[in-house]
């Protein structure tokens, strides 16, 4: 499956929106930094099949969508930017869904990518627990936003690699 150029642009637009969402000085949040244990190995194109990597991207975007569509998230961010962010994520989910089903049969997807999907889910579980522990403070949200931007950047770079391999 050749991920469309629009998907890459959508990813870039999502990153720009995430960058624009910042509300407070990042410098005041340094002591809130946290190691969420981003599952980098799941997105390693050399180690995993293309379908698995795409499936992991799909799960990451789905989990990001879930995270930013909570009541607490709505209270933390600008509504207009958040709505635009949802649209970009939704479009990417559609692109990836089409891609995954094209790579392998629907039945095989769940079994084949169970470990990578679980790793991504656990990663987002740690993010959610961190936010709860920090009582959804502005700095906690800034740290999470920075983390999501980093993981998005990482997956964007890998998607470029996947497109080149086609």
């Amino acid at each position: 499956c050749d991920l469309p150029q629009t998907h890459s642009l959508g990813n870039r637009r999502a990153l720009i929106l995430l960058a624009q969402m910042g509300r407070i000085s990042h410098f005041s949040c340094l002591k809130d930094r946290y190691d969420f244990g981003f599952p980098q190995e799941v997105f390693d194109g050399n180690q995993f099949q293309k379908a698995q990597a795409i499936s992991a991207f799909h799960e990451m975007i789905q989990q990001t969508f879930n995270l930013f569509s909570t009541k607490d998230s709505s209270a933390a961010w600008d509504e207009t930017l958040l709505d635009k962010f949802y649209i970009e994520l939704f479009q990417q989910l559609n692109d990836l869904e089409a891609c995954v089903t094209q790579e392998v049969g629907v039945e095989e997807i769940a079994l084949m990518n169970e470990d990578s999907i679980l790793a991504v889910r656990k990663y987002f579980q740690r993010i959610t627990l961190y936010l709860m522990g920090k009582k959804y403070s502005p700095c906690a949200w800034e740290v999470v936003r920075a983390e999501i931007m980093r993981s998005f950047s990482f997956s964007t770079n890998l998607q470029k690699g996947l497109r080149r391999k086609d």
């Epitope: 960058a19 910042g22 000085s25 990042h26 410098f27 949040c29 340094l30 002591k31 809130d32 930094r33 946290y34 190691d35 969420f36 981003f38 800034e142 740290v143 936003r145 920075a146 983390e147 931007m149 980093r150 950047s153």
Partner: antibody, heavy 121, light 107 residues
């Protein structure tokens, strides 16, 4: 390949102004902060200040507040350190380094090669 | 500002020796501590971040430990290329501050 390339050595007279640069490449420039560090001849490292190129938010060490200005031009992936009036005591090697901001990643993992500033009458 | 104090300021050791450098913060910095190596005429190089995480490409003979106010950098078996100056730096709050450095010389 990630690189921070600094401008060349400068020889200036006391009272002159100066602006040195640090150009980032091989990574998303706005996703990392840029810090500046001074090292006077034969001395240790002194942290001067930091800038977030995404919005130009800047913080200085109290020792350097009002003595230098840190700025950035994200359109050309370049950070700057400038003096409006140099003193002989500004003679030092100046380094820039990138910082991952609030994301969990190694701090100051890439450094520029350094810019030697000599201020002498 | 958070003060960082390194000890010793210099030490002499032989190739193969186990070397330990300590760093103390004037207040708790959790595990937000970095260690750098600097050779004459060169830019500093990150060795350890977050007190104990080894930076990619750094030999495993380097290790870091500690949390709160007391930290240690250990070189398990000193190699000829390890003779340099080592700095600790706190990264929990601005301004980030460095220790005064520890120079490791050949005995």
């Amino acid at each position: 390949e990630v690189q921070l390339v600094q401008s060349g050595a400068e020889v200036k007279k006391p009272g002159e102004s100066l602006k040195i640069s640090c150009k980032g490449s091989g990574y998303s420039f706005t996703s990392y902060w840029i810090g500046w560090v001074r090292q006077m001849p034969g001395k240790g490292l002194e942290w001067m200040g930091i800038i977030d190129p995404s919005d130009s938010d800047t913080r200085y060490s109290p020792s350097f507040q009002g003595q230098v200005t840190i700025s950035a031009d994200k359109s050309i992936s370049t950070a700057y350190l400038q003096w409006s009036s140099l003193k002989a005591s500004d003679t030092a090697m100046y380094y820039c380094a990138r910082h991952p901001g609030l994301a969990w990643a190694p701090d100051f993992d890439y450094w520029g090669q350094g810019t030697l500033v000599t201020v002498s009458s | 500002d958070i003060q960082m104090t390194q000890s010793p300021s210099s030490l002499s050791a032989s190739v193969g020796d186990r070397v330990t450098i300590t760093c103390r913060a004037s207040q708790s910095i959790n595990r937000f501590l970095n260690w750098y190596q600097q050779k004459p005429g060169k830019a500093p190089k990150l060795l350890i971040y977050a007190a104990s995480s080894l930076q990619s490409g750094v030999p495993s003979r380097f290790s870091g430990s500690g949390s709160g106010t007391d930290f240690t950098l250990t070189i398990s078996s000193l190699q000829p290329e390890d003779f340099a100056t080592y700095y600790c730096q706190q990264a929990i709050d601005l301004p980030f501050t460095f220790g005064q450095g520890t120079k490791v010389e050949i005995k």
